[in-house]
């Protein structure tokens, strides 16, 4: 029976050109984590394998850095990076746990003056 839960950073925003850390944490289970996959919509970003370590997809090598921990750091953010990100924990014997993070990348001025978009 799968008793674990994935805690994520949830919905987050960051500034264009900046960086952001995507973090997931698996709790409430004694299952062994064998591998964690990071995906953006339908693209594999990175894999952290208990035996083999990190593998970053070549097309993301310049902008994705492993860690901290099992997390993933996205750098040189663009507006196109806005969207859903998934951490997929492969565990033994439980199976697969999936967490979701939504990242919104804001134009610099929007990040600085976000209040102007609020309804008075």
């Amino acid at each position: 029976m799968m008793t674990g839960t994935i805690e994520t950073t949830g919905n987050i925003s960051a500034e264009k050109g900046g960086s952001i850390i995507l973090q997931c944490h698996l709790s409430s289970t004694t299952a062994q984590v064998t591998q964690v996959n990071w995906e953006q919509q339908d693209q594999l970003l990175a894999i952290c394998n208990a035996d083999l370590g990190w593998h970053i997809s070549p097309s993301f090598k310049d902008r994705v850095a492993p860690g901290p921990g099992l997390g993933l750091t996205l750098q040189s953010l663009t507006v196109n990076d806005t969207g859903e990100y998934f951490c997929i924990y492969h565990t033994y014997p439980d199976g697969t746990y999936t967490g979701r993070i939504f990242l919104e990348v804001l134009e610099s001025s929007v990040a600085e003056h976000g209040a102007r978009f609020q309804i008075p």
Epitope: T34, Q35, E39, D42, Q43, L44, I47, N49, D51, L52, H55, S57, S59, H90, Y92
Partner: antibody, heavy 118, light 107 residues
């Protein structure tokens, strides 16, 4: 240099058994999942079975489930496929392959031919 | 099980041609799609993994694209050594499944 060398193929009668071996060298064997893939004469590739690096998890195609058993001896850097209750449709070249990160198969052996015939 | 459908099953082309092979999955497989090349009497060789990542040592004329259900292998300028059979394979879930293959022949 990564090398995979299969052995144990041959001619066997229907209902018989055979054990294939795959000797690995050039990498840390216990860190990698491994897989068996077969190819019937003139046909395409068919995945048969896979096993995790520790040997704790095994996976099988429906066509061989209950008849074939995959195993590994990490102290000997060797992968095995025990094939029982063999059928004519099991006739194929059997390849072992290394499976990094549990997904793609990046290195393959040269294959060993299994012929099931009376 | 996830079915993988490759097209065409065979094609004739000349050296220097741009060749495109397509692979369709029966359900979304994210980017868990790999391409292999096989020559007669030889073991398959990994070309592309995770839909678009070029395996080390593979010439850059090979490229892969796609995500979800539709994928493409492109050879930008066909060379004499590229005449072979090409297979796609999904690694999204077990049982792992291959496409039926595409044989690239000399025109």
């Amino acid at each position: 240099e990564v090398q995979l060398l299969e052995s144990g193929g041959g001619l066997v009668q229907p209902g018989g058994s055979l054990r294939l071996s795959c000797a690995a060298s050039g990498f840390t064997f216990s860190s990698y999942a491994m897989s068996w893939v077969r190819q019937a004469p003139g046909k395409g590739l068919e995945w048969v079975s896979a096993i995790s690096g520790s040997g704790g998890s095994t996976y099988y195609a429906d066509s061989v489930k209950g008849r074939f058993t995959i195993s590994r001896d990490n102290s000997k850097n060797t992968l095995y496929l025990q094939m029982n209750s063999l059928r004519a449709e099991d006739t194929a070249v059997y390849y072992c392959a290394r499976v990094p990160y549990g997904y793609w198969m990046d290195y393959w052996g040269q294959g060993t031919l299994v012929t099931v015939s009376s | 099980d996830i079915q993988m459908t490759q097209s065409p099953s065979s094609l004739s082309a000349s050296v220097g041609d741009r060749v495109t092979i397509t692979c369709r999955a029966s359900q979304s497989i994210s980017s868990y799609l790999n391409w292999y090349q096989q020559k007669p009497g030889k073991a398959p060789k990994l070309l592309i993994y995770a839909a678009s990542s070029l395996q080390s040592g593979v010439p850059s004329r090979f490229s892969g694209s796609g995500s979800g259900t539709d994928f493409t292998l492109t050879i930008s300028s066909l060379q004499p050594e590229d005449f072979a059979t090409y297979y796609c394979q999904q690694s999204y879930s077990t049982p792992l499944t291959f496409g039926g293959g595409t044989k690239v022949e000399i025109k």
